[in-house]
Interface confidence: low
């Protein structure tokens, strides 16, 4: 039985750890999936890198890596996410 979106939101976004990150159950990040998205825009100067989630995931997602090595799932349809990705590509 596949776990529900609600349960996966609980998985890593608990009272102690709620940075809206509910992704990546594997240490090799290319297999990461997003099951919920951050509800807040992350300050752009916090972002170090990004990667897109696998096409095999049930939801599309962009995972931003912050300069403090946090990983945050974001909705690729949001304008700010697209802008950050474009800026990161341009600066690469």
């Amino acid at each position: 039985m596949q776990v529900s979106t609600a349960a996966l939101a609980v998985l890593l976004c608990t009272m102690a750890l709620c940075n809206q990150f509910s992704a990546s159950l594997a240490a090799d990040t290319p297999t990461a999936c997003c099951f919920s998205y951050t509800s807040r825009q992350i300050p752009q100067n916090f972002i170090a890198d990004y990667f897109e989630t696998s096409s095999q995931c049930s939801k599309p997602g962009v995972i931003f890596l912050t300069k403090r090595s946090r990983q945050v799932c974001a909705d690729p349809s949001e304008e700010w996410v697209q802008k950050y990705v474009s800026d990161l590509e341009l600066s690469a």
């Epitope: 890593l12 608990t14 102690a16 750890l17 992704a23 990040t29």
Partner: nanobody, 111 residues
Amino acid sequence: EVQLVESGGGLVQPGGSLRLSCAASGFAFSTNAMSWVRQAPGKGLEWISTINSGGWRSYADSVKGRFTISRDDGQNTLYLQMNSLKPEDTAVYYCVHQNYRGQGTQVTVSS
């Protein structure tokens, strides 16, 4: 470097019990939420349970009342006590911290 090492799996008869352990290192264990997930043969990852640094616990409906998650912050160890095991609990069980998981421990429930 984050390391998670699970142990305690094995072959058990239906109705039996097992206690899984996860030895954690490379991060501040006591201040982080920890979880167990499992993967049955040919299936995707299924979330089982989470415990946060304050001891708050959450369980999947499929294991509620049978499984108990706990932690020992002094030993940097996460536990999963599994009682009243069923054949459908057969899976590889993984300990999870953020975007890391261990290599897993196999649990087989069969008569």
